[in-house]
């Protein structure tokens, strides 16, 4: 091992304080005891160390804890967290939500870094499921967090956690993710009355099946076009003109502007032109009068 430079006389650090910002890197290495640093980590964040000095402090902690830092140190890492690699973080066992919050705060306002992604992964795996408090915290820092999870990972979200989800948290979710989240939301909000239920379930409807959309059409919900356009095409196609009219209420006139886009375009192709004409919107492309409509999927199912 390389012989370490001795600490100059009178420079041995007795506490982590601002005098250390004037130490050269080799003096920090020689004069700061790693155990002292570990017990006074909460001070480091309040002292404007340079990035080079932070490198030295990290090195000292790495030597003291080669198997990974204890949570008492992790909680107070502050800006030193930005110096950690995903490999470092994989050695940690983070169980406290307060620790998670403290570290997310350091990265606040920035994109989710590989370090943060690894930290969250470690934390959630340690907990076994994505509970409400954790979800609350993660979506507060990263609104798109939920949609970054795979359908398999989303399956571990308990229905009770769905209460923490805000509409903007689902903005980037794809249909596969909403397919997983919708049944959980339906379960979570099942005891709410009609209008309140619709307000809560609306963001999740991209995962709703046809029968649920039919049920909603009987409840005067007045779904807006933006929500309608996010519905699963296969769930919209079987809806009748009357059901869509009831589902959208006053928003039905918006169909004209969307007639070339899915799922409206595909739905129009499945409706009788006579029925479409009853809407008075000038929607074209329906099945001409006198044509026989065969539901081949039903035929295949019977054979």
């Amino acid at each position: 091992e390389v012989e370490k430079t001795a600490c100059p006389s009178g420079k041995k650090a007795r506490e982590i304080d601002e005098s250390l910002i004037f130490y050269k890197k080799w003096e920090l290495e020689a004069c700061v005891d790693a155990a002292l640093l570990a017990t006074q980590m909460d001070r480091v964040n309040a002292i404007p160390f340079t990035y080079e000095q932070l490198d030295v402090l990290k090195h000292k902690l790495d030597e003291l804890y080669p198997q990974g830092y204890p949570e008492s140190v992790i909680q107070h890492l502050g800006y030193l967290f930005l110096k950690m690699s995903p490999e470092d973080i994989r050695k940690w066992n983070v169980t406290s939500l307060e620790t998670l919050k403290a570290l997310l705060e350091v990265n606040k306002g920035h994109e989710m870094s590989p370090q943060v992604a690894t930290l969250i992964d470690r934390f959630v795996k340690g907990r076994g499921q994505l509970d409400k408090d954790t979800l609350d915290t993660l979506t507060a820092f990263y609104p798109g967090y939920l949609c970054s999870l795979s359908p398999e990972e989303l399956s571990s979200v308990p229905p009770s956690s769905i209460w923490a989800v805000r509409p903007q948290d689902l903005d980037t979710c794809d249909p596969r993710q909403l397919d997983v989240l919708y049944p959980k939301a339906r379960l979570a909000f099942q005891n709410m009355n009609g209008s309140e239920y619709f307000v809560k379930i609306q963001s999740f409807l991209g995962g709703a099946p046809t029968e649920d959309l039919k049920a909603l059409s009987q409840q005067n919900v007045s779904m807006d076009l933006a929500t309608f356009m996010k519905l699963r095409t296969d769930a919209v196609l079987p809806l009748t003109v009357a059901e869509v009219q009831k589902l959208l209420g006053p928003h039905v006139e918006g169909l004209k502007a969307e007639e070339r886009h899915r799922p409206v375009r595909d739905w129009i192709l499945r409706q009788r032109q006579d029925d479409l004409d009853t809407l008075g919107l000038g929607l074209q492309g329906g099945i001409p009068n006198g044509y026989l409509v065969l539901d081949l999927s039903m035929q295949e199912a019977l054979s």
Partner: antibody, heavy 116, light 110 residues
Framework: EVQLLESGGGLVQPGGSLRLSCAAS????????MSWVRQAPGKGLEWVSG????????YYADSVRGRFTVSRDNSKNTLYLQMNSLRAEDTAVYYC?????????WGQGTLVTVSS | QSVLTQPPSASGTPGQRVTISCTGS????????VSWYQQLPGTAPKLLIY???KRPSGVPDRFSGSKSGTSASLAISGLRSEDEADYYC???????????FGGGTKVTVL
């Protein structure tokens, strides 16, 4: 026990000069940044100047820059403030304090009066 | 006009809790630690809180500090007559290359 003892204050005419000293004991003076803070009669605290352990950079409030000079002699454990071109608004009690980011020890202060 | 803003006065009866605010900007409180100083009448200031929330030895735990964003606050719980003093907040400001103080808050015990 940490002790800071200021001296050199007194009555001086506008345009005159004074040199304040602060003798430090009870800690390793050469390891710590030092500062000067003043307080005009009946007013709040105003930071004047700061100097790191090695005197490498010196920091001054806009109100004194170009007129005051901070220095230190680590071999004598002493901090100095050379004040030139003094004005009536420089009248205050001048304190020396340990550190530059949080002043954990203060002297008792020395009064500087600038008046004709 | 001080760079950090404090209320000029605060008061309370013995035993009460008093809170003093200190508002700055991203260049001082937002990016650096806050300290609080107590100045009893006719004496030099004394460090009360450093690094936002730490108490030097000898300072009673009735005094507590906190920081959030560009603001900080000092709380005195269980107010006593000997707490009657001026209280100043302070922080380093890299944009000014200097230390800045609040204007001070006079705490009166009724």
């Amino acid at each position: 026990e940490v002790q800071l003892l200021e001296s050199g204050g007194g009555l001086v005419q506008p345009g005159g000069s004074l040199r304040l000293s602060c003798a430090a004991s009870g800690f390793t003076f050469s390891n710590y940044a030092m500062s000067w803070v003043r307080q005009a009669p009946g007013k709040g605290l105003e930071w004047v100047s700061g100097i790191p352990p090695d005197s490498g950079s010196k920091y001054y409030a806009d109100s004194v820059r170009g007129r005051f000079t901070v220095s230190r002699d680590n071999s004598k454990n002493t901090l100095y403030l050379q004040m030139n071109s003094l004005r009536a608004e420089d009248t205050a009690v001048y304190y020396c304090a340990k550190n530059m980011l949080s002043f954990d020890y203060w002297g008792q202060g020395t009064l500087v009066t600038v008046s004709s | 006009q001080s760079v950090l803003t404090q209320p000029p006065s605060a008061s309370g009866t013995p035993g009460q809790r008093v809170t003093i605010s200190c508002t700055g900007s991203s260049s001082n409180i937002g990016s650096n630690a806050v300290s609080w100083y107590q100045q009893l009448p006719g004496t030099a200031p004394k460090l009360l809180i450093y690094y936002n929330s730490k108490r030097p030895s000898g300072v009673p735990d009735r005094f507590s500090g906190s920081k959030s964003g560009t603001s900080a606050s000092l709380a005195i719980s269980g107010l006593r007559s000997e707490d009657e003093a001026d209280y100043y907040c302070g922080s380093w400001d890299p944009s000014l290359n200097g230390y800045v103080f609040g204007g001070g808050t006079k705490v009166t015990v009724l």
